[in-house]
Interface confidence: medium
């Protein structure tokens, strides 16, 4: 599923991401835009043999199990394929664990490079939330 901007903002808010660990909803929508272009089925392979999955591009080295990443920790205790569902519950629950891990949203390279320090509220402007 490819979400619309406001559709995703609403879904993320419903799942409790607004101001989760101090990160406003705009941060999460911005991260999703630049990680996956709002596509729940996005997958991208990394040079270390791991793969990033889903709307927030969650990595198989640490957070989920895809059955083929050497030394996978699977800290969210889920199959990576669950992160590709049109229902973003699994991605949101895992993202909450990631953002609580100490580095906050710096764990997402795209957020760090494209969203951090910008007007992230623009990503939810005009949305009926």
């Amino acid at each position: 599923k490819v979400f619309g901007r406001c559709e995703l903002a609403a879904a993320m808010k419903r799942h409790g991401l607004d101001n989760y660990r101090g990160y406003s909803l705009g941060n999460w929508v911005c991260a999703a835009k630049f990680e996956s272009n709002f596509n729940t089925q996005a997958t991208n392979r990394n040079t270390d043999g791991s793969t990033d999955y889903g709307i927030l591009q969650i990595n198989s080295r640490w957070w989920c199990n895809d059955g083929r990443t050497p030394g996978s920790r699977n800290l969210c205790n889920i199959p990576c394929s669950a992160l590709l569902s049109s229902d973003i519950t699994a991605s949101v629950n895992c993202a909450k664990k990631i953002v609580s891990d100490g580095n906050g949203m710096n764990a997402w390279v795209a957020w760090r490079n494209r969203c951090k320090g910008t007007d992230v509220q623009a990503w939810i402007r005009g949305c009926r939330l």
């Epitope: 089925q41 997958t43 043999g49 895809d66 059955g67 083929r68 050497p70 199959p79 394929s81 590709l84």
Partner: antibody
Framework: QVQLQESGAEVMKPGASVKISCKAT????????IEWVKQRPGHGLEWIGE????????YYNEKFKGKATFTADTSSNTAYMQLSSLTSEDSAVYYC?????????WGQGTTLTVSS | DIELTQSPATLSVTPGDSVSLSCRAS??????LHWYQQKSHESPRLLIK???QRASGIPSRFSGSGSGTDFTLSINSVETEDFGMYFC?????????FGGGTKLEIK
């Protein structure tokens, strides 16, 4: 136990297309990548690409882009590989395998012969 | 693409001999190297995963070693059922690649 059952041997004419199937049993089909491998005598084993059945995400070896197309049907636990514009170079045994990085589980292979 | 070079291409041995098969990668692949045995008209069978871990049901006479670019599959006291082709495969990066194979034949 995990099993991958491939479709039977095919004899095709040059220029035609063929669709090979791989039915998986014994595990959660949607959560593991299915890989496709080509074997020709004297050419060893070649990785064609992979599909994640749960999402339909695919990756192809550059060499096989435009030649192979992967699909999967999670309702029947079956992965498919279509090969198009067949030539004699496509005559080979084609294997599906479960993608665990290594390949512990293989199909029995589908022999494709392209001949006029 | 990572190239895997296997040597020798053919190895002629007598049952009871011990042998070593080599697989060399064109760049470092850590321990992401796997070994397969294939007999005529059969699918490949996983022997060793991640350079040194024996796959389930594989006899202890098979062992693997190496890291980086140089890897070895050793068979201690070859048995008649061991004859066939042996391939290495890397999962360090895409595309996945295989070695050209070593044929283990009876002398």
């Amino acid at each position: 136990q995990v099993q991958l059952q491939e479709s039977g041997a095919e004899v095709m004419k040059p220029g035609a297309s063929v669709k090979i199937s791989c039915k998986a049993t014994g595990y959660t089909f949607s959560t593991y990548w299915i890989e496709w491998v080509k074997q020709r005598p004297g050419h060893g084993l070649e990785w064609i690409g992979e599909i994640l059945p749960g999402s339909g995400s695919t990756y192809y070896n550059e060499k096989f882009k435009g030649k192979a197309t992967f699909t999967a049907d999670t309702s029947s636990n079956t992965a498919y590989m279509q090969l198009s514009s067949l030539t004699s170079e496509d005559s080979a045994v084609y294997y599906c395998a479960r993608g665990d990085g290594y390949y512990c589980y293989w199909g029995q292979g589908t022999t494709l012969t392209v001949s006029s | 693409d990572i190239e895997l070079t296997q040597s020798p291409a053919t190895l002629s041995v007598t049952p009871g001999d011990s042998v070593s098969l080599s697989c060399r990668a064109s760049q470092s692949i850590s321990n992401n190297l796997h070994w397969y045995q294939q007999k005529s008209h059969e699918s490949p069978r996983l022997l060793i995963k991640y350079a040194s871990q024996r796959a389930s049901g594989i006899p202890s006479r098979f062992s693997g070693s190496g890291s980086g670019t140089d890897f070895t599959l050793s068979i201690n006291s070859v048995e008649t059922e061991d004859f066939g082709m042996y391939f290495c495969q890397q999962s360090n990066s895409w595309p996945r690649t295989f070695g050209g194979g070593t044929k283990l034949e009876i002398k």
